[in-house]
């Protein structure tokens, strides 16, 4: 059976998953996949760690916590209705059939958009500026509200800056080999 988590379109979704490392630095591989946990591994892998690093992730899927401390909670950035469904967190403990499996059902709700007087305000209300702070643990997403003076170029620049800074953080923290898919 799976447990249910909710997020709104345009927000970041947080899917919690933890394990206790046997000893500091004694990490076990973890995979996150879209779809219920199969008998082995994860189907449709969106992120994977090994004994040392985050060694695979796809765009919009990342670990906001410190996986070296056993926090392998998944953050899905800027969710859409298509992100709804079951996700598998699999802690790949050595030994036969020792894996811990968690099936998490993500339910995406349509964004609550407040009608605004101008077309420009409609756009910024529907796409508020999102800042995600890097933190070890549950994702903190702050919506700063409507920014009436922002234009499409600025939004695109902001999105790229956020993405680049996150990748820089992840690179610094994990030394991962990156595949952005």
């Amino acid at each position: 059976s799976e447990v249910e988590y909710r997020a709104e379109v345009g927000q970041n979704a947080y899917l919690p998953c933890f394990y206790t490392p046997a000893a500091p630095g004694n990490l076990v591989p973890v995979c996150w996949g879209k779809g219920a946990c199969p008998v082995f591994e994860c189907g449709n892998v969106v992120l994977r760690t090994d004994e040392r690093d985050v060694n695979y992730w796809t765009s919009r899927y990342w670990l906001n916590g410190d996986f070296r401390k056993g926090d392998v909670s998944l953050t899905i950035e800027n969710v859409t209705l298509a992100d709804s469904g079951i996700y598998c967190c699999r802690i790949q403990i050595p030994g036969i059939m020792n894996d811990e499996k968690f099936n998490l059902k993500l339910v995406i709700k349509p964004a609550k958009v407040t009608p605004a007087p101008t077309r420009q305000r409609d756009f910024t209300a529907a796409f508020p500026r999102m800042l995600t702070t890097r933190g070890h643990g549950p994702a903190e997403t702050q919506t700063l509200g409507s920014l009436p003076d922002i234009n499409l170029t600025q939004i695109s620049t902001l999105a790229n800056e956020l993405r680049d800074s996150r990748l820089a953080n992840d690179l610094r923290d994990s030394g991962a080999t990156i595949r952005i898919g």
Partner: antibody
């Protein structure tokens, strides 16, 4: 043996600040989150916040934003809790604890803080 | 913030009894719940983590169950040394939160 050794009892005046310490032995604080928890006399446990000593990143409970500052010194394997603008409401026992990663497996012995003129 | 509603706030039971303490959580936390025992004048001590896992060195008379929003701590064959206050705690989301506590007394 894993231990968290906290600093001694404090008696301070209203409006002042105080800094409590928590020194870990038998483990490296960089490998764990360190938390502070408040307990007033005959009352329950309140989570103040935590630090990741590895990079200094902190989280605080909403009630303690602006009141508490958590820091760590990895060279001495010690975490600190600074409380400012003290009032009688801050009179309590303060515990440090280690999480692994979402539950508290070891606790310090507690530091009693009394705020009184 | 996630609210933790622990009940009862106090209870009195006889030696040898089996007692149950419940913790109701305001939103789904899967199994990321722990139970602690605090004896008078002492520090809290971890009993159960991940809703049902017994911490090292804790007697098997303690057991935990539940997932999602409803959790229980069961103490079987009550002993004098079980006199304490028991707390639940969620570790899924910041800020971490504790239940209000259940004070256990022996009749």
């Amino acid at each position: 043996e894993v231990q968290l050794q906290q600093s001694g009892a404090e008696l301070v005046k209203p409006g002042a600040s105080v800094k409590l310490s928590c020194t870990a032995s038998d483990f490296n604080i960089k490998d764990y989150y360190l938390h502070w928890v408040k307990q007033r006399t005959e009352q329950g446990l309140e989570w103040i916040g935590r630090i990741d000593p590895d990079d200094g990143e902190t989280k605080y409970g909403p009630k303690f934003q602006g009141k508490a500052t958590i820091t760590a010194d990895t060279s001495s394997n010690t975490a600190f809790l600074q409380l400012s603008s003290l009032t009688s409401e801050d009179t309590a026992v303060y515990f440090c604890s280690r999480s692994n990663p979402y539950y508290f497996d070891y606790w310090g012995q507690g530091t009693t803080l009394t705020v009184s003129s | 913030d996630i609210q933790m509603n622990q009940s009862p706030s106090s209870l009195s039971a006889s030696l040898g009894d089996t007692i149950t303490i419940t913790c109701h959580v305001s939103q789904n936390i899967n199994v990321w719940l722990s139970w602690y025992q605090q004896k008078p004048g002492n520090i809290p001590k971890l009993l159960i983590y991940k809703a049902s896992n017994l911490h090292t060195g804790v007697t098997s008379r303690f057991s935990g169950s539940g997932a999602g929003t409803g959790f229980t701590l069961t103490i079987s064959s009550l002993q004098p040394e079980d006199i304490a206050t028991y707390y639940c705690q969620q570790g899924q989301n910041y800020p971490y939160t504790f239940g209000g506590g259940t004070k256990l007394e022996i009749k």
